[in-house]
Interface confidence: medium
């Protein structure tokens, strides 16, 4: 039934980047400027997102895909699809309702966005602290004290885990 219906529906032939124009006998018309259709068979084109104010254009709108925004310098994205922009803080800080605040002792933030996270607890993995943590950097865990006995092979400490960086400025 679905297959029969699609064969009878002239709109199903309209590709992405066009819409099925009811005002013109269901002819496939190109999307007007500043609009797009990302799938075929659409009866209207969607208005392109405009990256204005604190937003800037990361990817231009095309006839088949919406524009994508990130944030102007000094701001970073929040929310799905960069729905909001928020001012950067310094590394070693997190944004609170009262502005940017330094990370509490025992926590760190190595980015200009996001929240302060606890230092890694090296002892949970049976390791010792090789490099102390700071507000900006996690601790570096080294080999456990037992591994440091004479003749034990040296171990390269793992780099601290990093979250993906925010949108490029």
């Amino acid at each position: 039934f679905e297959r029969t219906r699609s064969l009878q529906d002239p709109c199903s032939n309209c590709p992405a980047g066009t819409f099925c124009d009811n005002n013109r006998n269901q002819i496939c018309s190109p999307c007007p400027p500043n609009s797009f259709s990302s799938a075929g068979g659409q009866r209207t084109c969607d208005i392109c997102r405009q990256c204005k104010g604190v937003f800037r254009t990361r990817k231009e709108c095309s006839s088949t895909s919406n524009a994508e925004c990130d944030c102007t310098p000094g701001f970073h994205c929040l929310g799905a699809g960069c729905s909001m922009c928020e001012q950067d803080c310094k590394q070693g800080q997190e944004l609170t309702k009262k502005g940017c605040k330094d990370c509490c002792f025992g926590t760190f933030n190595d980015q200009k966005r996001g929240i302060c996270r606890p230092w890694t607890n090296c002892s949970l993995d049976g390791k010792s602290v090789l490099v102390n943590g700071t507000k900006e950097r996690d601790v570096v865990c080294g080999p456990s004290p037992a591994d440091l006995s004479p003749g034990a092979s040296s171990v390269t400490p793992p780099a601290p885990a990093r979250e993906p960086g925010h949108s490029p400025q």
Partner: antibody
Framework: QVQLQESGPGLVKPSETLSITCTVS????????VHWVRQPPGKGLEWLGV???????DYNPSLKSRVTISKDTSKNQVSFKLSSLTAADTAIYYC????????????WGQGTLVTVSS | DIQMTQSPSSLSASVGDRVTVTCRAS??????VAWYQQKPGKAPKALIY???YRDSGVPSRFSGSGSGTDFTLTISSVQPEDFATYYC?????????FGGGTKLEIK
Amino acid sequence: QVQLQESGPGLVKPSETLSITCTVSGFSLISYGVHWVRQPPGKGLEWLGVIWSGGSTDYNPSLKSRVTISKDTSKNQVSFKLSSLTAADTAIYYCARNPLTATVMDYWGQGTLVTVSS
Amino acid sequence: DIQMTQSPSSLSASVGDRVTVTCRASQNVGTNVAWYQQKPGKAPKALIYSASYRDSGVPSRFSGSGSGTDFTLTISSVQPEDFATYYCQQYNSYPLTFGGGTKLEIK
């Protein structure tokens, strides 16, 4: 109402360090960034740098090694320092607030003229 | 750095004239352009941001348009207080850069 006021030395000698303070009122430095812009006599505007609400700074690469911007939120003051001065640094220096809507300057101080001369 | 080239560098107009100032960016800056007005001996004043949004308190005779690389500031009917120098500024990327200015003089 929103106000920014620069205070500077007026005259500085070559090779010295310029220090200007911008005192703000009508808004909080916890929420707003502050830019520094200069204008040589009879010429156009040049962006020098910005300090954001959280204290992070961004500088114009052409001056980066010579510029330092800091702030004292409790005193409502932003400090601008420019080292290794030459006659080419003679200009009016402005501080200006960054709104929450874009990386622009919505309110400006009246500016302070700095002359670099021996 | 993104260069912002303004034209003309100066123009003469009479009260009531329609005036247009243009600004061209050396690369695509989307709509991340602001316009400022500066009178002699005074600090610049924000007029427009995001290429077309008037700042609060700016008279409706000022309008901005454009996107990408070409931008326009239009004064629909010049008033005596509009004679000043106008600057465009891009804020798409660091360093923030200004145009060289356009001086609007009385004819």
